[in-house]
């Protein structure tokens, strides 16, 4: 913008001001009407010095100066009038020139500034945008981190809480375990003492039982012998009485038969007049070797030699080949007579085999084979059976044809497995077959779905473990 102003300053002088945009131009001019009269030497329009001159020297000089001053004043007045007349024109011209020159420069500078400003603005805008993007991205990341941190903090708090709970639980359990350990150690000590006492008692009782068994056998044999002697005496007495009562009789001496004191099986014992069921001593055929067996003198006419019996699980039937060969257990309870004795016995005469079975529901059944024998040890005591009858199934639960005998240490079955180890006990396993009367003994209510129980498939089906079994033999011609 452009502006022209005329004003008076504080000293009374006139000043002319030209304002053009931010630039201001001031012109100061001398004033004639403010000059005083020279009536006093000190009041002249002379230039004032720093200090006044001496009066004598300066009077003449002042006179000259006054004349010059007068001329100058006249000239100045003319100049002033001239200026006053021409000022307006000149001022307009000056103003125009100044404005034009200033405008051109200012436009140039302005344009340059505008360009620079625009460039700077663009740069600033770009930077602002970048900063804004970066800020937004950082804010988002910060937000995500904040969320993650919150989650983690929550998880840590949860886990800490859980750990504290577990620690408390652990402490509680540790205490419980310690308490239980204490109790258990006490109980264990007590049980050990009881066990020791019981072992002593058992060993005492075992020796007492052995003695009683021996006495019983002796008593039974003695009783049987006495019965036989009594029977023989009665016959002799009767014979003598007959002879004495007969008038034509010749005196003769009654010849007694030689008394039989060794028995090959229970049938012979029965036939000898010993008809009470119990333990008897049998002698191996063609040998003096003896073996104790239980004789059943009651079932089906008596005379049965019991070769196997199960009733309560008191005897372990998972035995070695040697044990099954020689026999184990007690003839009064659970036992296996022995494969070698049975093989020798059944190899000499024809025997029948009767198998008696009991289930846990109070039922009984039997299978009867009209010919039974075991081959020798060289043939792994292979079983041979024919002629099945009875109530324990129409099909033989002992595989036909007969299988070799197998034990945990002698695998002679037809299975890719080892049946004796899998099913427990020694038996004439096939692969593995429908029966195993020497399996693991299971008590009532735990006797179903068993893979290794006392099994007779064609009576009770698979997995049913029986309560009691008895295998017994007798000569076919008894």
């Amino acid at each position: 913008y452009s502006n022209f102003r005329k004003s008076v300053d504080s000293t009374g002088r006139r000043q002319y001001q030209v304002q053009n945009g931010p630039c201001s131009y001031t012109f100061l001019l001398p004033e004639t009407d403010s000059c005083r009269s020279s009536s006093s030497p000190y009041m002249s329009n002379a230039v004032q010095r720093d200090a006044p001159l001496d009066y004598d020297d300066s009077v003449q000089r002042l006179q000259v100066l006054e004349n010059i001053l007068e001329n100058n004043t006249q000239w100045l007045m003319k100049l002033e009038n001239y200026i006053q007349d021409n000022m307006k024109k000149e001022m307009v011209e000056i103003q125009q020139n100044v404005v034009q020159n200033q405008t051109a420069v200012m436009i140039e500078i302005g344009t340059s500034l505008l360009n620079q400003t625009a460039a700077q603005t663009r740069k600033l805008t770009d930077v602002e945008a970048q900063v804004l993007n970066q800020t937004t991205r950082l804010e988002l990341q910060l937000l995500q981190h904040s969320i993650s941190t919150n989650k983690l903090e929550k998880q840590i708090l949860d886990q800490t809480s859980e750990i504290n709970k577990l620690q408390n639980k652990n402490s509680f359990l540790e205490q419980k375990v310690l308490d239980m350990e204490g109790k258990h150690s006490e109980q264990l000590q007590s049980m050990k003492e009881q066990k020791d006492e019981l072992q002593v008692l058992v060993s005492k009782q075992s020796s007492v039982i052995d003695e009683l068994e021996k006495k019983l056998v002796t008593a039974t044999v003695n009783n049987s012998l006495l019965q036989k002697q009594q029977h023989d005496l009665m016959e002799t007495v009767n014979s003598l009485l007959t002879m004495m009562s007969s008038p034509n009789s010749k005196s003769s001496v009654a010849i007694r038969k030689e008394e039989q004191t060794t028995f090959r099986d229970c049938a012979e014992i029965f036939k000898s007049g010993l008809t009470t069921s119990g333990i008897y001593t049998l002698t191996f055929p063609n040998s003096t070797e003896e073996i104790k067996a239980y004789c059943d003198m009651d079932v089906g006419g008596g005379g049965w030699t019991v070769i196997q019996h199960r009733e309560d699980g008191s005897v372990d039937f998972q035995r070695t080949w040697k044990e099954y060969k020689e026999g184990f257990g007690s003839p009064l309870g659970e036992y296996w007579l022995g494969n070698e004795f049975v093989s020798q016995l059944t190899g000499q005469h024809r025997y029948v085999l009767k198998i008696q079975l009991k289930d846990w529901e109070g039922n009984e059944a039997h299978s009867l084979y009209d010919h039974f024998y075991l081959a020798g040890e060289e043939s792994n005591y292979r079983i041979h059976l024919t002629g099945l009858t009875g109530t324990a199934g129409k099909i033989s639960s002992i595989s036909q044809p007969g299988s070799d005998f197998s034990t945990k240490d002698s695998d002679n079955d037809k299975c890719i497995c080892k049946c004796s180890q899998m099913l427990s006990g020694g038996w004439w396993f096939d692969a593995c077959g429908p029966s195993n009367l020497n399996g693991q003994y299971y008590p009532q209510k735990q006797n179903t779905n068993k893979f290794n129980g006392i099994k007779w498939y064609y009576w009770k089906g698979s997995g049913y473990s029986l309560k009691a079994t008895t295998m017994m033999i007798r000569p076919a011609d008894f």
Epitope: I416, C417, F451, Y457
Partner: nanobody, 129 residues
Framework: EVQLVESGGGLVQPGGSLRLSCAVS????????IGWFRQAPGKEREGVSS????????YYADSVKGRFTISSDNSKNTVYLQMNSLRPEDTAVYYC??????????????????????WGQGTLVTVSS
């Protein structure tokens, strides 16, 4: 204690399908073969299908070949019998049973019924219109 529980039986029309399940506990299917058997009223129990070796070996009776499919899920200890194109003569109580996988005769592939020692209670399948 070994337990086998059958499920999935029911009434279905001829030509229909059923899927039987046998949930086994107390043993692992890795070591045992599982067989499906059925018993119709007045008839002997007969083998239908068996599976062992994680499904590597399967057996089907001639009467069900092409219609029945046996499978097992060892992770669930469960054996399935998918029965398609059912006929009235398929009506029976269906049982599943277990046998130790190794209890095999030399040269044989499958097990006689008496070797299966653990049995379920059975599920009735009736095919009738």
């Amino acid at each position: 204690e070994v337990q086998l529980v059958e499920s999935g039986g029911g009434l279905v029309q001829p030509g229909g399908s059923l899927r039987l399940s046998c949930a086994v506990s107390g043993i692992t299917l890795d070591d045992y073969a599982i067989g499906w058997f059925r018993q119709a009223p007045g008839k002997e129990r007969e083998g239908v299908s068996s599976i062992r070796d994680n499904g590597g070996s399967t057996y089907y009776a001639d009467s069900v070949k092409g219609r029945f499919t046996i499978s097992s899920d060892n992770s669930k200890n469960t054996v399935y019998l998918q029965m398609n194109s059912l006929r009235p003569e398929d009506t029976a109580v269906y049982y599943c049973a277990a046998v130790p996988a190794g209890r095999l005769r030399y040269g044989e592939q499958w097990y006689p019924i008496y070797e299966y020692d653990a049995w379920g209670q059975g599920t009735l399948v009736t095919v009738s219109s």
